[in-house]
């Protein structure tokens, strides 16, 4: 009876279990009753990082110098190239597909430390009593407006992203 499942590092094809190609190699032809799976090594600028049945290897990532990228770790037949940014610049994401001079702190966060040539912007959440309603690479959290000092009352509470809204006091008639 033909198998319905195969062992690890095998795949089912034509009611038969064939060996997967090892990392760094691509599939040329499936196994048969009489022959093993045929695999070929990936080319110079290609890779496959898993046991696979892919017929094409993936291209190594290109670290585009026009985007400020450079190679941190050269790719192999089994691993992709890892990019990083030029000195003083910072990756915009884990994948490092582009570079920024410094990250900004989102609304609700203030700048704790402005970026330098070696370290990116350090953000901190605005604590109770403070807010930031902008994305910025230099602005700290701002204190809520003090309604009392203006002889007003709080009409709307502040949040980490919004200031309080002050209004006139109710006058007793």
């Amino acid at each position: 009876e033909p198998p319905t499942a195969c062992r690890e590092k095998q795949y089912l094809i034509n009611s038969q279990c064939c060996s997967l190609c090892q990392p760094g190699q691509k599939l040329v032809s499936d196994c048969t009753e009489f022959t093993e799976t045929e695999c070929l090594p990936c080319g110079e600028s290609e890779f496959l990082d898993t046991w696979n049945r892919e017929t094409h290897c993936h291209q190594h990532k290109y670290c585009d110098p026009n985007l400020g990228l450079r190679v941190q770790q050269k790719g192999t037949s089994e691993t992709d190239t890892i990019c990083t940014c030029e000195e003083g610049w910072h990756c915009t994401s884990e994948a490092c597909e582009s570079c920024v001079l410094h990250r900004s702190c989102s609304p609700g966060f203030g700048v704790k430390q402005i970026a330098t040539g070696v370290s990116d912007t350090i953000c901190e959440p605005c604590p109770v009593g403070f807010f930031s309603n902008v994305s910025s690479a230099f602005e700290k959290c701002h204190p809520w407006t003090s309604c009392e000092t203006k002889d007003l009352v709080v009409q709307q509470a502040g949040t980490n992203k919004t200031d309080v809204v002050c209004g006139p006091q109710d006058r007793l008639r």
Partner: nanobody
């Protein structure tokens, strides 16, 4: 496409003044925090000054505090840097930058040389 065109650089004697301008296009200038950064020969980029979108809040690096003034004219989509009491160590290519400052957003910069 973001375009930033810096101008106003030149050769100036120590103690002299220059006013740099940056003409912005390709984005809504009034919505963005803007920066001036500089790169001295053989050095990395240094953050010089920044201004919030409304022009009401500013930042200055310690090295230029009290000598440089950043400003903006949102009606003209232009950023300025007034540089007074210039020193030899202010010699650099000056770039204006929009937040976030993407590497490929850089303009050509304007060269400021302070020398006697």
């Amino acid at each position: 496409e973001v375009q930033l065109l810096e101008s106003g650089g030149g050769l100036v004697q120590p103690g002299g003044s220059l006013r740099l301008s940056c003409a912005a296009s390709g984005f809504t200038f009034r919505d963005y925090e803007m920066w001036w950064v500089r790169q001295a020969p053989g050095k990395g980029l240094e953050r010089v000054s920044a201004i919030n979108p409304q022009g009401t809040r500013t930042y200055y690096a310690d090295s230029v505090m009290g000598r440089f003034t950043i400003s903006r004219d949102n009606s003209k989509n232009t950023l300025y840097l007034q540089m007074n009491s210039l020193r030899a160590e202010d010699t650099a290519v000056y770039y204006c930058a929009k937040l976030p400052f993407m590497f490929d957003d850089r303009g050509q910069g304007t060269l400021v040389t302070v020398s006697s």
